[in-house]
Interface confidence: low
């Protein structure tokens, strides 16, 4: 499903908006990019405050949401490869529009190490928790979901996008209804502060069409770093009211004339706007004329003023902004430098780790050291990289390729490889007999045998070994153990009908198979098939089934 | 200055309504939450819940839910408190009192109070 | 809910005498470092008066003399030396959890 309610809240230079809908977080973040912005950063706690306004918005309108915990797809994520970093307070996640290695974090709980798939974060929303501003939404990280299958996606997610500037709500002088159009696509009634480039329809009247008056302005910058909708005095005013509705649109001071007109003034130390609405302090300063982080310091009578940058920073050319000095010019680290605002970070590519002589110097992390490995079975350590190893009678599986995956032999891309019977087991398999018959030595083949009512035979002793050099099953190139990491063979028998000919009879009994010892009680009825062997005995009707063990210590059978 | 105006004392039956108003000045009505907060004689103050003026999100008490309604009137930069089915119990000084819109909601301008006596 | 209990319910103390009012919450308030616990004052009559919130942060306006401390459940409003218009009733209140609850109050009377 796509993404339905949306909240927005709307601050500083910047609009947040919550979706419900049960995306990936690459749905999320394309659904929030097709109109302009990405998926929201948390950078702060003022920032976070603002992301959980939006979703108390969201969830106060969005009754369907009705299950205890509630998560939202945030900016912040972590590609497949890059690993956890515990020292950072991003834990080596970073977010999606890029930027710098942010100070705040709230995670929900410590992170286990992966670096093998891409991880995405969310923020945990506790419903049954009153959403109390203090209490900020927990980030939780896991899989990013996949597109297309809801089942694996989480119930919503908040965007952000940035404006060069905000303007001021419009400011009814009295009845109407404002609705803003946002440059994302967004309508709303009631925004604290409106993004530049929205634009506003007014209707005036209180729902009397024969009175109802429109207007439509946009949102516009006036001049560098000031925003206005080129309106001029209070709007939609009305004889009735004068100043009684809502301060007439006024910003400070609302002066009644005697014939219902009135005017907006402002207090001491203030001047009115262009607007007639606004008021703005005389204080070059308090219209805040300096930006990224530069202060603003006042010239002589308080007439001009200067902006003055921290340590790290310099002033750009238009002497109002303060630009990062790029301390990574110098290359000061050994692999990878990460300018950060007022300084610089050294970092190291994936698979390295920080130490080694110097400053700024990195050394290889080994995945495979004990307790660390990603690794089923085997591991090795690589420069910069690992890479992982099944024994013998296993292969490499999982989307990572860190599990083990036995194979089964009894059903290779070659054929059976025993001549009736074969028994798949964990790392391993082994040949059998259908009753009547014994396993010869070669453990493989099977040869017609005195019908015994003993027990049938269990896997060769170490005495047995020498028994089936020269055997015809092929060898494996090295040896594995017979047995797979838990210790009991799985027993799926799969019968190799030996026969003289593809037209020999198959008896139509069932085959009941007697359980060889150490393999699990439980047992499959033997699917039989042709064995492509030109000669061997019929098979007979009754009798004992013989089974042998292949060994993979260097005897025949190994994988 | 910053002030809270409640409107005047009630007398009201047991079983009755009441509806009392909070008009705020010398400050962005739309920029604090605005709670009610009652205290009955005697006893320990009692918060109700609260209600954010720039998009009418409302909080209650759950002692109080189903019988309590806030509401706001943008315009004229007033709150009101409707508290129904009145019981003798309910007889206290009312107030509605402001707090900060992020982190710790504590009040930091109250109105001078109403008080309601509910009595048959 | 959280259950504020203060200490003493009542008091009797001189002016230029220091005071302390202690206040428990029957679980933690507080939340990502901060303490949700604050203090008012309150005279017959007359609508509560903040005088410090987040447990030490003295609100603009109120006169040093007040200081509040604690964190978790245990938390201590101060006065260092009491001035004629301090003779009034002390609440403490939680806003980490809602509801927002009060203690039930200390009343600092004139010895």
């Known amino acids: 499903t796509g993404a339905d309610t949306e909240a927005v809240v709307c601050v500083g230079t910047a609009c947040y908006t919550a979706h419900s809908g049960k995306l990936s977080a690459a749905e999320a973040q394309n659904h929030c990019n097709q109109n302009g912005g990405n998926l929201a950063t948390v950078k702060s706690k003022e920032e976070a405050q603002h992301v959980q306004r939006v979703l108390a918005q969201l969830l106060r309108r969005e009754a369907a949401l009705t299950a205890r915990m509630s998560k939202f797809w945030i900016g912040l994520q972590r590609e497949k490869g890059k690993c956890l970093d515990p020292s950072l307070p991003l834990k080596g996640f970073s977010w999606v529009g890029g930027g710098e290695d942010t100070p705040y974090s709230n995670w929900h709980k410590e992170l286990r190490n992966s670096c093998i798939s891409k991880r995405c974060v969310s923020l945990l929303l506790d419903l049954s928790q009153p959403l109390l501003p203090s209490r900020l939404p927990k980030w939780s990280e896991g899989p990013c979901g996949s597109p297309g299958s809801p089942g694996s996606n989480i119930e919503g997610f908040v965007c952000k996008f940035s404006f060069k500037g905000m303007c001021r709500p419009l400011a009814l002088g009295g009845p109407g209804q404002v609705t803003y159009t946002t440059p994302f696509q967004t309508t709303s009634s009631s925004l604290e502060a409106v993004p530049f480039a929205s634009a506003a329809n007014v209707a005036c009247g209180e729902g009397d069409k024969d009175e109802t008056q429109s207007h439509y302005f946009l949102c516009k910058e006036k001049a560098p770093d000031v925003f206005d909708w080129g309106s001029s005095g209070p709007l939609c005013v009305s004889p009735k009211y004068g100043c009684n509705f809502n301060n007439g649109g006024c910003h400070q001071d609302c002066f009644e004339g005697g014939d219902g007109s009135f005017l907006c003034g402002c207090r001491p130390g203030f001047r009115l706007l262009d607007d007639l609405v606004t008021c703005a302090s005389r204080n070059p300063c308090s219209s805040s004329p300096c930006r990224g982080g530069a202060t603003c310091v006042l010239g002589p009578h308080g007439k001009n003023y200067t902006c003055r940058c921290p340590q790290g920073y310099q002033l750009d050319s238009s002497q109002l902004d303060c630009v990062d000095v790029d301390e990574c010019q110098d290359s000061p680290c050994a692999q990878e430098c990460v300018n950060t605002p007022g300084g610089f970070r050294c970092e190291c590519w994936v698979g390295y780790e920080p130490g080694g002589p110097g400053e700024g110097a990195c050394q290889d992390v080994d995945e495979c050291a004990l307790g660390r490995s990603p690794c089923a079975q085997g591991c090795t350590n690589t420069d910069g990289s690992f890479h992982c190893s099944c024994e013998e009678g296993y292969v490499l599986a999982g989307e990572d390729g860190t599990q083990c995956q036995d194979v089964d032999e009894c059903v290779g891309p070659g054929g059976p490889l025993c001549d009736s019977l074969c028994f798949n087991t964990q790392g391993s398999f082994h040949c059998g007999c259908l009753p009547g018959w014994v396993l010869a030595p070669n453990g493989v083949s099977c040869t017609m045998g005195p019908v015994s009512l003993g027990p049938p035979s269990g896997p060769p002793d170490e005495e047995d070994k020498g028994e089936k050099e020269g055997s015809t099953v092929p060898r494996a190139a090295t040896a594995s153990p017979t047995r797979g990491p838990e210790g009991t063979p799985k027993a799926t028998p799969t019968t190799s009908r030996p026969s003289l000919s593809s037209d020999a009879p198959i008896t139509s009994a069932p085959l009941k198979m007697l359980a060889p010892s150490g393999s699990p009680g439980v047992w499959r009825e033997p699917s039989i098939h042709h064995a492509t062997a030109a000669s061997g005995p019929q098979e007979p009707a009754g009798g004992d089934s013989s089974v042998a063990t292949q060994n993979n210590d260097g005897t025949d059978g190994q994988k | 200055q910053v002030q809270l105006v409640e409107s005047g004392a009630e007398v009201k039956k047991p079983g009755a309504s009441v509806k009392l108003s909070c008009k705020a000045s010398g400050y962005t009505f739309t920029s604090y939450w605005m709670h009610w907060v009652r205290q009955a004689p005697g006893q320990r103050l009692e918060w109700m819940g609260e209600?954010?003026?720039?998009?009418?999100?409302?909080y209650y008490n759950q002692k109080f839910k189903g019988r309590v309604t806030i509401t706001v009137d943008k315009s004229a930069s007033t709150a009101y408190m409707e508290l129904s089915s009145l019981r003798s119990e309910d007889t206290a000084v009312y107030y509605c009192?402001?707090?900060?819109?992020?982190?710790?909601?504590?009040?930091?301008?109250w109105g001078p109070g109403t008080t309601v006596t509910v009595s048959s | 809910d959280i259950v504020l209990t203060q200490s003493p319910s009542s008091l009797s103390a001189s002016v230029g005498q220091r005071v302390t009012i202690t206040c428990r919450a029957s679980q933690s308030v507080d939340y990502a470092g901060d303490s949700y616990m604050n203090w008012y004052q309150q005279k017959p009559g007359k609508a509560p008066k903040l005088l410090i919130y987040a447990a030490s942060n003295l609100e603009s306006g109120v006169p040093s003399r007040f200081s509040g401390s604690g964190s978790g459940t245990d938390f201590t409003l101060t006065v260092s030396s009491l001035e004629d218009e301090d003779f009034a009733t002390y609440y403490c209140?939680?806003?980490?959890?809602?509801?927002?609850?009060f203690g039930g109050g200390t009343k600092v009377e004139i010895k």
């Open positions: 209600i954010d003026p720039s998009a009418s999100y409302t």
């Open positions: 209140q939680q806003t980490n959890e809602d509801p927002r609850t």
């Open positions: 009192a402001r707090s900060v819109y992020y982190g710790n909601k504590y009040f930091d301008v």
